[in-house]
Structures are given as structure tokens and as C-alpha cells.
């Protein structure tokens, strides 16, 4: 595959507000060619955030990153940490993109695009050793609700870009630019192959603490914060909801007021959510900024699912 | 109401391992994490790691040394907190508890157990 | 590891006191910083948390302040049921740590 260089296909219109480094696991900077120059972080959950450079925090994140990653390569030459056993899942979980980024692949694949892997999900973590963002499509195994954004607490509110969760394969969106200025981070999980027949719901599930060193992906979320509503405790579920075809320009996890026109051509027709209605072409949340990625159809191999807005998912009184 | 509710007091020799569950109610258990946090004898706390149910998916503080191991019976809502070679120093009051927030804000702890007193006495 | 000071480590006042208590940590957590009450015998309790919002159901009477590495918890006007031991929590980077405690007793 041709990298192109030059060609800026992460452009960001406006930046988060501060995450903890403690959630973050990778960090890249977006390409010259963008113009106004960016930093992409990725949480645990492989949600993709864009940060100012400039700001004392992501200075400090970065930093932290680099010290991380140069620790694990002392500790073995390698990026592989152990996070316990992660027992393979029956669903996937969404990875996520700021929907102030605007992705642009080219069809050539001449840039960056969509493209699929042949490994499973929990395979492509084992292995994700690639230093090349965005990785809004590989996901981290599991079933969670997705986050209500941190209007709140002056938090990172309509920044995240749009989630992309993997199906059987793990797509990757192959940046056209070379990993810089840091090391990359991508801590790896290491996978427990062996299947189970017991119901993932009702199964015992266990993790040991590795030899000392952080282990990085995968952190739970909430979709409330202390003080503003209660924790919901029968909301949907990631595992509840049916195959969504690849043709739906589906997307969640939108902040107030932002929009998205994502151009996506079928390659499948076949499944259908088992509780959110999907649209086909063009899907607005909530109008403000928009986001337009273009994606070769090609090699469009993800399913995109929706979750409904974790606003109005039920609460527990 | 979420709620946590922890096992009750261990006496354990040295060299032995201790099991203390926390059983969640209120909420998703699988969504969010649960942490553990240690307070010895007129100390203060100390975060031990986190784990969150839905994919096993876990962080330990080094200074357990690989002495941590974080089991969950997602059928009942119960984590479980194992800590072996146990020295007289592990002597201390365990709390489970939880993080309300998404993954942009981070970990502090709106929930927690009871706790569950581990003596460490040959 | 970022390192949490409290001070001080204890403090008496009495009912309808204003008190502080300081909490420095050894880098900057950019404001990703808890507070704790804890009663003997009990769990703790979150009083403020990130850009000290308050937590729910904590009275106005506490409120924090700070910045980089230096923040503050302000009680201003003690009550009866205020006098507990009071820990500080950083989150910015794991391992999470929290301050070696403040207590507050009764002059």
C-alpha cells in the first residue's frame, strides 16, 4: 500500500478539553499538511480525541505517554502488556472518533482508508503494534454503555469523533503520516483463546495483576457523572442490539449540538438493529458542526452500530 | 440505590491468601469499574487497582507486586479481591468502590463498600 | 508516581469555624483532583471532585480551589457533623493517589 505523505486526512475544527492521562493509552499528531496542527489522543476505549499542542495538559500527556512507552521498551523491547485475561466477547465495542475531525481517505487508498484485517477483534489487540492513528475501529472487547458526553463538568462535550465498531474483522484507518513526535503506546492485551460455552453473562471472569508496570486499555464507562443523575441500571446494552448494515450512516456518542454527513456506500444489506432505527444515507444528530468522511466502499468491513443517546437511555430513580 | 456490599472480617496467617467479595446493586455492574482501595491501621488509602467486569479488562498499583488477582461472577453482581503471601503489613481495612465517569473524566470514587477488615497475625 | 502532601495533618476548630486544608501533589493533575470525608469505622465519602464540582448531596459550606499542584478544600462554616478525617485524591495519572489526611477535630 502507498502512504501519501503530504496529504492531511485528520483535520480537526476544534479540541477537547482535558482528559486524564490515566485514560489515555496513544497519542499522534496530526500532519503538516492539516495546517492548524493538532494532537490525537486515544482513551482506552479507542475513542479518538483531538487536543491543542499548545495546552499544559496535553503537553503533559504526551509526556507521559512518551516516559510510558519508553519504559515498556526497557522492560523487553516490546509494547505488549499483560491486562489480565481478556476473555474473547461475543460483541463488539465501539471504538470512537471526535466528531470535529474530518477523515479523509482517499478511494485509491493512495492515503488512508478503511481497511479491514483478517484477524478477530481480540487478535488485532493482541497485535495492535501499528503507530499509525486513527484507530477509531479496533475495539476493545466488552459490552458498555457509551459515555454521556461532560457537558456538566466543562468536559470534553462535542469533540469525540464518530464511533466505528468492529464486526469479526478489525478495521484500521491507516494514517498516511508517520508516528510523531513521541514513541507509540499502543498497549496491547493479551487474549485468552480458549472458547467458552457458557453464557458471557453468567461468566466467571478474572483478571491478575501483571508483573509491575501499567497496563493500559479498556476502562469502564458511565453515563452520568456524581451529582448530575443516577446511574442507569437496565439501560441497552451493546450486547442487546442486533447487526446493523454497513450501509447506515449511523453514529453515537454526538456532544450538543454537532452534525454529521458521513458517506458510506453499502456493501451489505443484511441484519437489522434489534432496537434502534437506523438510517440509510445521510443522518443528522442534533445539528451544529459538521464532520464528512468519505470512505472507499470497497474496503468498508465494519458494521456501524447505534446506541441510543445516553441521555435519554433509561435512568434508575 | 447502588449499592456495595462487601464480605465480612478475615483473620489469615502469614503466607496465606485472603478472597473478599463486593456484590453490586443499583446499577450495571458490567459498565463501570470497581476499584479496590487499602487502609491500614491509622494510614491513610491507597489505591490498589481497577477492574471493570464487562471485559475483564484491569489496572493494578505496582506496589502490590502481582500479589492482586480480580475475579467477578458477573451472574451475581460480585467482584472479588484475592491477595496472596500475605504479610503482616496487609493488615488493613479493603473498600471496594466505583467511578462514576465516562472515559474523558476520570477516576474518583462516588461509591463505596463498607469494608472488610483483613488481620494478618501469626 | 505523583505524590500527594496534605496539610495539616491535623487541625482543631470549633462550630462556625472557616477552615482550609491544603493538598500539594509532587506534579501537575490539571485539576483532575477528590475529596474525601471519612467518619471512624466508615467508608469515605466524595465531597468535590474535577474543577471542584461539588459532589451530590454535599452541602455549599464545602467548596475547593486550586490549580497545577496546589489546591485547597474550604469549609466555611463548621457544623457539628464536619469533624471526620479529610483525604485528597489525585486521578490525572495512575497509580492513583490520595493524600496522607487531614483531621479534623472539635477545639
Known amino acids: 500500500q502507498h502512504h501519501g505523505v503530504t496529504k492531511c486526512n485528520i483535520t480537526c475544527s476544534k479540541m477537547t478539553s482535558k482528559i486524564p492521562v490515566a485514560l489515555l493509552i496513544h497519542y499522534q499528531q496530526n500532519q503538516a499538511s492539516c495546517g492548524k496542527r493538532a494532537i490525537i489522543l486515544e482513551t482506552r476505549q479507542h475513542r479518538l480525541f483531538c487536543a491543542d499542542p499548545k495546552e499544559q495538559w496535553v503537553k503533559d500527556a504526551m509526556q507521559h505517554l512518551d516516559r510510558q512507552a519508553a519504559a515498556l521498551t526497557r522492560n523487553g523491547g516490546t509494547f505488549e502488556k499483560q491486562i489480565g485475561e481478556v476473555k474473547p466477547r461475543t460483541t463488539p465495542a465501539a471504538g470512537g472518533m471526535d466528531e470535529s475531525v474530518v477523515l479523509e481517505p482517499e478511494a485509491t487508498g493512495e492515503s488512508s482508508s478503511l481497511e479491514p484485517t483478517p484477524s478477530s477483534q481480540e487478535a488485532q489487540r493482541a497485535l495492535g503494534t501499528s503507530p499509525e492513528l486513527p484507530t477509531g475501529v479496533t475495539g476493545s472487547s466488552g459490552t458498555r454503555l457509551p459515555p454521556t458526553p461532560k457537558a456538566q463538568d466543562g468536559g470534553p462535550v462535542g469533540t469525540e469523533l464518530f464511533r466505528v465498531p468492529p464486526v469479526s474483522t478489525a478495521a484500521t484507518w491507516q494514517s498516511s503520516a508517520p508516528h510523531q513526535p513521541g514513541p507509540s503506546l499502543w498497549a496491547e492485551a493479551k487474549t485468552s483463546e480458549a472458547p467458552s460455552t457458557q453464557d458471557p453473562s453468567t461468566q466467571a471472569s478474572t483478571a491478575s495483576s501483571p508483573a509491575p508496570e501499567e497496563n493500559a486499555p479498556s476502562e469502564g464507562q458511565r453515563v452520568w457523572g456524581q451529582g448530575q443523575s443516577p446511574r442507569p441500571e437496565n439501560s441497552l446494552e451493546r450486547e442487546e442490539m442486533g447487526p446493523v448494515p454497513a450501509h447506515t450512516d449511523a453514529f453515537q456518542d454526538w456532544g450538543p449540538g454537532s452534525m454529521a454527513h458521513v458517506s458510506v456506500v453499502p456493501v451489505s444489506s443484511e441484519g437489522t438493529p434489534s432496537r434502534e432505527p437506523v438510517a440509510s444515507g445521510s443522518w443528522t444528530p442534533k445539528a451544529e458542526e459538521p464532520i464528512h468522511a468519505t470512505m472507499d466502499p470497497q474496503r468498508l468491513g465494519v458494521l456501524i452500530t447505534p446506541v441510543p443517546d445516553a441521555q435519554a437511555a433509561t435512568r434508575r430513580q | 440505590e447502588v449499592q456495595l456490599v462487601q464480605s465480612g472480617a478475615e483473620v489469615k496467617k502469614p503466607g496465606a491468601t485472603v478472597k473478599i467479595s463486593c456484590k453490586a446493586s443499583g446499577y450495571t455492574f458490567t459498565n463501570y469499574n470497581i476499584h479496590w482501595v487499602q487502609q491500614a491501621p491509622g494510614k491513610g488509602l491507597e489505591w490498589m487497582g481497577w477492574y471493570l467486569p464487562g471485559d475483564d479488562s484491569s489496572k493494578f498499583n505496582e506496589r502490590f507486586e502481582g500479589r492482586v488477582t480480580i475475579t467477578a461472577d458477573r451472574s451475581t453482581n460480585t467482584a472479588y479481591m484475592e491477595l496472596s503471601s500475605l504479610r503482616s503489613e496487609d493488615t488493613a481495612v479493603y473498600y471496594c468502590?466505583?467511578?462514576?465517569?465516562?472515559?474523558?473524566?476520570?477516576?474518583?470514587?462516588?461509591?463505596w463498600g463498607q469494608g472488610t477488615t483483613l488481620t494478618v497475625s501469626s | 508516581d505523583i505524590r500527594m502532601t496534605q496539610s495539616p495533618s491535623s487541625l482543631s476548630a470549633s462550630v462556625g469555624d472557616r477552615v482550609t486544608i491544603t493538598c500539594r501533589a509532587s506534579g501537575r493533575i490539571h485539576d483532575f483532583l477528590a475529596w474525601y470525608q471519612q467518619k471512624p469505622g466508615k467508608a469515605p465519602k466524595l465531597l468535590l471532585y474535577t474543577d471542584n464540582t461539588l459532589a451530590e448531596g454535599v452541602p455549599s459550606r464545602f467548596s475547593g480551589s486550586g490549580s497545577g499542584t496546589d489546591y485547597t478544600l474550604t469549609i466555611s462554616s463548621l457544623q457539628p457533623e464536619d469533624f471526620a478525617t479529610y483525604y485528597c485524591?489525585?486521578?490525572?495519572?495512575?497509580?492513583?493517589?490520595f493524600g496522607g489526611g487531614t483531621k479534623l477535630e472539635i477545639k
Open positions: 468502590a466505583t467511578s462514576p465517569t465516562d472515559e474523558t473524566q476520570g477516576d474518583y470514587f462516588d461509591y
Open positions: 485524591q489525585q486521578f490525572w495519572s495512575t497509580p492513583y493517589t
